[in-house]
Interface confidence: medium
Amino acid sequence: ILNSSTEDGIKRIQDDCPKAGRHNYIFVMIPTLYSIIFVVGIFGNSLVVIVIYFYMKLKTVASVFLLNLALADLCFLLTLPLWAVYTAMEYRWPFGNYLCKIASASVSFNLYASVFLLTCLSIDRYLAIVHPMKSRLRRTMLVAKVTCIIIWLLAGLASLPAIIHRNVFFIENTNITVCAFHYESQNSTLPIGLGLTKNILGFLFPFLIILTSYTLIWKALKKAYEIQKNKPRNDDIFKIIMAIVLFFFFSWIPHQIFTFLDVLIQLGIIRDCRIADIVDTAMPITICIAYFNNCLNPLFYGFLGKKFKRYFLQLLKYIPPKAKSHSNLSTKMSTLSYRPSDNVSSSTKKPAPCFEVE
């Protein structure tokens, strides 16, 4: 019914606020930030992949999740230069329809994959620390790998709307070719659904699971310390737990708030161009915060482990890994030297470190 070829695109007028989010400082600042995220992210995540796969030989459940987290980040980072150019060109998409779909799907995929992986990592930490014996059979490499496959499939499913509905088209009154969602009338409620899905499935539920997992870990460790009254208390563990939860929360909350405001604008609840301008201006900034922190996650989580830290620094000094075969059978526990559920009197070690990758 409507010719929407990539050459001609869809000729149409933009809505009320054509200048919303279109500021010169955005067109300079955002591409600069994207470039920094790209360089730091590619470097950091590539090293994480090398350390976990070649040095640490992918032996633990936590390392499987971290490896997948780094790989998901790398998939996203590869499309970041396209978004940098797009923003620098004042939201003009020069790369064609195919790359528009791929790059858009990559952003959505990374959000869901990384959030789901962090959630699974928090559940794994909970099982390993609070129920080390009970969960030994469940926390196998096979289960971890299958979980990762399911996560990638779910993230892929969540990215399908971008592949289907993201298109390159021409906006009449601003004379620009954009890479954006386009819906025929029967799908016009879809962007609202996508925004709310991002809020609920991409943040609210995972955050509640992460918060619950680390709260239960906190309580278990506190209980262990109370039993071991004669041992010095290691507050580092509690600081790490706080850091993990707060880092996740503050990374994503700005983007999630503005996504929700965007939904309210889409619904017509907010009709003020000034608010639309604030939302459209803030959105790329919140994306920078969320995805930059996201790309730092493998490093952040990895550095909680002593072996990871050692291998990472070793790699930076160009020391090759020892020739050692990959062990798929190893389901070595990746957590406490002392565990709250063990017999307290037989242990003389203090409860640390609880977040080792290996």
């Epitope: 409507l2 869809i10 149409r12 007028i13 933009q14 809505d15 009320d16 606020c17 054509p18 919303a20 088209f169 009154n173 954006a180 969602f181 386009h182 819906y183 025929e184 009338s185 799908n187 016009s188 409620t189 962007p191 609202i192 965007d262 604008i265 889409q266 619904l267 017509g268 009709r271 161009c273 639309a276 459209d280 959105m283």
Partner: nanobody, 118 residues
Amino acid sequence: QVQLQESGGGLVQAGGSLRLSCAASGYIFYRYSMGWYRQAPGKEREFVAGISYGATTNYADSVKGRFTISRDNAKNTVYLQMNSLKPEDTAVYYCAAWGGRTDYFVYWGQGTQVTVSS
């Protein structure tokens, strides 16, 4: 679901005038723009004129100065006043409602025939 109902089409002589109306009914989720597209026999559908909720107007070069678009937000209706009509304006005129800032959608009417005889 949104329905768009066009009216006002018909047969007119070259140089004459016509006024098309398009009424939107049903619940619309978004702030939306409205406008007109046309499709002549054997040709692709082309943009004619559009007007945003805030009454920002936009016209195709071929109709500038001859056609005027306006809207009544209270009635959810858009009008296209067509003056100095030419035979090349002969086409099926489609009413459209669309919206979005980063997300876009479009609703279509069934179309109304405008024939300009020479």
